[in-house]
C-alpha cells in the first residue's frame, strides 16, 4: 500500500542527513539554486529549484521523493512565488536548511 | 516571573512510595508538556517522564515504568510525581521542566526547577 | 533505545575554542538541544533545535549537527563557562527523551 506520511517524510529526512553527511567535494560542485520560502507549498518551490541543478546524482533520490510531496509535474525552469527570487545559495545550504525546516515539521506533526 | 518549584523531596525506605510537586507560575502552564528529570550524586542527567498539555499521554523512561506515575491540575498549575515501590538507585535529585507542546514532544526545556533531593535507604 | 555519546571531558585555555561533540546514529534527523549545568545549580539551555540560542545566551555558544554528529562550540571561552554540558534529544522510535552522558568542561 502506500507509505504513511510520516514515514515519507521520516525518509526524506534521513535522506538529505545523508547527502550532508557524505560530501566530500562541494555538493553539486557548488551548484547554486533560488532560495525558497520555507512556508506551505514549500515542497514544490524546493523541488522546482533543485531540479534546475543537472547532472548531480547526489540529489536525484531527494528530487524523486520531494516529487511525491508535490501534488503537480514539475519541470526545469518553473518557478513559484514561493522562491526569493533574488538570492540563490549553495546547494549544500539549500539542503542544510530545508532538513532542519523538515525537522520541525516531522515534530510539529505536519507529515503533508 | 516565570518559575518552577519542586517540593515533596526526603528520606524514605526502599518498598515505600513519595509524591514530588512541580508549583508553576508566571506563565500558562496547560500550554506546556511538562517533564521530570533527575540527577543521581555525581551522575549525569535522566529524563524520568512526560505528561503532554492536556494530559492526555504520558511517556516513562524504562527504569520507571509501572512504578513512577506523573499527574497534572492544570486548574491549580501543579505537577506531581507519585513514586512507588522505591529503590536505593532511585536516589537523586529530581527537577521538573517545562517544553513547548507539539505533535511530538520533541521540545527544549527552556525552564527548570532548582530541584528536589529524594534519599531511598533503609 | 538511543544513545548518545559525550566525551567525559574536554580543557581549554582562558580565550580559545571549545568544541563538545554528541554523537548519534543518523543524529542528524535529530533536532539537538544543548545544556549548561554548574555544581549546585539546575540545568540552562543554551541552544536549542541544533543550532538556535536563546536571547540570554552569549553569541559565543553555537551548535551544528551533520551526519552522526552533533556539535557544540564555545568560541573565547571564559572561566566561567567551566561546567557541565548535556546534549539531548527526543527518539521517536521509543517515545523517550535521552540525554547524553555529559561533558565537563574545564578552562585551563
Known amino acids: 500500500g502506500p507509505v504513511p506520511p510520516s514515514t515519507a517524510l521520516r525518509e526524506l529526512i534521513e535522506e538529505l542527513v545523508n547527502i550532508t553527511q557524505n560530501q566530500k567535494a562541494p555538493l553539486c560542485n557548488g551548484s547554486m539554486v533560488w532560495s525558497i520560502n520555507l512556508t506551505a507549498g514549500m515542497y514544490c518551490a524546493a523541488l522546482e529549484s533543485l531540479i534546475n541543478v543537472s547532472g548531480c546524482s547526489a540529489i536525484e533520490k531527494t528530487q524523486r521523493m520531494l516529487s511525491g510531496f508535490c501534488p503537480h509535474k514539475v519541470s526545469a525552469g518553473q518557478f513559484s512565488s514561493l522562491h526569493v527570487r533574488d538570492t540563490k545559495i549553495e546547494v549544500a545550504q539549500f539542503v542544510k536548511d530545508l532538513l532542519l525546516h523538515l525537522k520541525k515539521l516531522f515534530r510539529e506533526g505536519q507529515f503533508n | 516571573q516565570m518559575q518552577l518549584v519542586e517540593s515533596g523531596g526526603g528520606v524514605v525506605q526502599p518498598g515505600r512510595s513519595l509524591t514530588l510537586s512541580c508549583a508553576a507560575s508566571?506563565?500558562?502552564?496547560?500550554?506546556?508538556?511538562m517533564h521530570w528529570v533527575r540527577q543521581a550524586p555525581g551522575k549525569g542527567l535522566e529524563w524520568v517522564g512526560v505528561?503532554?498539555?492536556?494530559?492526555?499521554?504520558?511517556h516513562y523512561a524504562d527504569s520507571v515504568k509501572g512504578r513512577f506515575t506523573i499527574t497534572r491540575d492544570n486548574s491549580k498549575n501543579t505537577l506531581n510525581l507519585q513514586m512507588n515501590s522505591l529503590r536505593v538507585e532511585d536516589t537523586a535529585v529530581y527537577y521538573c521542566?517545562?517544553?513547548?507542546?507539539?505533535?511530538?514532544?520533541?521540545?527544549?526545556?527552556?525552564?527548570w526547577g532548582q530541584g528536589t533531593m529524594v534519599t531511598v535507604s533503609s | 533505545s538511543y544513545i548518545l555519546t559525550q566525551p567525559p571531558s574536554v580543557s581549554v585555555a582562558p580565550g580559545q575554542t571549545a568544541t563538545i561533540t554528541c554523537g548519534g546514529n543518523?543524529?542528524?534527523?535529530?533536532?539537538v538541544h544543548w545544556y549548561q549545568q554548574k555544581p549546585g545549580q539546575a540545568p540552562v539551555l543554551v541552544i536549542y533545535?541544533?543550532?538556535d540560542r536563546p536571547s540570554r545566551i552569549p553569541e559565543r555558544f553555537s551548535g551544528s549537527n551533520i551526519g552522526n554528529t552533533a556539535t557544540l562550540t564555545i568560541s573565547d571561552v571564559e572561566e566561567g563557562d567551566e561546567a557541565d554540558y548535556y546534549c539531548q534529544v527526543w527518539d521517536y522510535s521509543s517515545d523517550h527523551m535521552v540525554f547524553g552522558g555529559g561533558t565537563k568542561l574545564t578552562v585551563l
Open positions: 543518523l543524529i542528524g534527523a535529530k533536532l
Open positions: 521542566a517545562r517544553a513547548p507542546q507539539w505533535y511530538l514532544t520533541a521540545e527544549a526545556f527552556d525552564l
Open positions: 533545535d541544533d543550532s
Open positions: 508566571g506563565f500558562e502552564f496547560r500550554t506546556y508538556g
Open positions: 505528561i503532554w498539555d492536556d494530559g492526555s499521554n504520558t
